[in-house]
């Protein structure tokens, strides 16, 4: 049984503070079952960014349809990105549970936020 | 819908410690920021402190750094503040207030605790 | 640190006068702006955000204009419920989270 890998292609994206930011990543088992979150940062003091399953997060919308069967693109699209919003995305895999468990993480994408051009 | 509910405010003397608490219900607590944003008497609004949805990352006014802690507990939809070395100038409502999304506004405010430091 | 001024501080109306407030920036903020109403002896409520959308349950007597660093809140049609100290306050720029002074509305 191949391992679950979580894949982010891009190791860094730059947007314009006011634009949209597109955060890519795959997985390559729909195995085991559980949902796929985004966080910003790492370790305890990590932003929840999105959450497959539960939260309502107005400023990100996901890619691919996450109802759709056997889908495995998790990327995201953030809107209206703010200098607040720069630092380094991880795509994570849990395992479903009471809590769910982390699994795995993808490497990361850093997000730069470029001033609005004037 | 939305409700957040304060307590644990009073009356105490300067140099002493008070616990804030901030019962949430109508949204799935675990997954928002949450923050206290104060009001003295006659003033506007000043925000206190953040924390992030997990618990393990806050920030802090520089007037209350050092005195007060906020944390959480995402099994008992609560919010806290811990204030210790309380001064005359704490003296204020305080609301918890939860945010939009992580980089947001405050979208919902709570009814307020009023805490009075006073010899 | 961005610093919010809010002007007038106090504006008084008769009822279905508009009302105009402003709230400028000491830097761009964007369009991260938002209005918060605090009527005598209760919580603030969230009415604008993102400059200019209502928030819900608002009536549309209430708008948002503006970005960069000047932003407008204006009443249409005041009512006399619409007595209240109005905020502005930036998530352009954190920590920390910065509110304006208020601009407290009188209707007459």
């Known amino acids: 049984e191949e391992e679950l890998q979580v894949i982010q292609p891009e190791k860094s994206v730059s947007v314009a503070a006011g634009e949209s930011a597109t955060l890519n990543c795959t997985a390559t088992s729909l195995i085991p079952v559980g949902p796929i979150q985004w966080f910003r940062g790492v370790g305890p003091g990590r932003e929840l960014i999105y959450h497959q399953k539960e939260g309502h997060f107005p400023r990100v919308t996901p890619v691919s349809d996450p109802t759709k069967r056997n889908n495995m693109d998790f990327s995201i699209r953030i809107s209206n990105i703010t200098p607040a919003d720069a630092g380094t995305y991880y795509c994570v895999k849990f395992r479903k549970g009471s809590p769910d468990v982390e699994l795995k993480s993808g490497a990361g994408t850093e997000l730069s936020v470029r001033a609005k051009p004037s | 819908d939305v409700q957040l509910v304060e307590s644990g405010g009073g009356v105490v003397r300067p140099g002493e410690s008070l616990r804030l608490s901030c019962a949430a219900s109508?949204?799935?607590?675990?997954?928002?920021?949450m923050n206290w944003v104060r009001q003295a008497p006659g003033e506007g609004l000043e925000w206190v402190s953040r924390?992030?949805?997990?618990?393990?990352?806050?920030d802090y006014a520089d007037s209350v750094k050092g005195r007060f802690t906020i944390s959480r507990d995402n099994s008992k939809n609560t919010l806290y503040l811990q204030m210790n070395s309380l001064r005359a100038e704490d003296t204020a409502v305080y609301y918890c207030a939860k945010q939009y999304d992580w980089n947001s506004f405050f979208d919902y405010w709570g009814l307020g605790a009023l805490v009075t430091v006073s010899s | 640190e961005t610093v919010l001024t809010q002007s007038p501080a106090t504006l008084s109306v008769s009822p279905g006068e508009r009302a105009t407030l402003s709230c400028r920036a000491s830097q761009t903020v964007g369009s991260k702006l938002a209005w918060h109403q605090q009527k005598p002896g209760q919580a603030p409520r969230l009415l604008i955000y993102?400059?200019?959308n209502r928030a819900t349950g608002i009536p549309d007597r209430f708008s948002g204009s503006g970005s960069g660093t000047d932003f407008t809140l204006t009443i249409s049609s005041p009512q006399t419920e619409d007595s209240a100290v109005y905020y502005c306050q930036q998530y352009y720029y954190w920590p920390p989270y910065r509110f304006g002074g208020g601009t407290k509305v009188e209707i007459k």
């Open positions: 993102d400059a200019s």
């Open positions: 109508g949204f799935s607590f675990r997954s928002y920021a």
């Open positions: 924390i992030n949805s997990g618990g393990g990352g806050t």
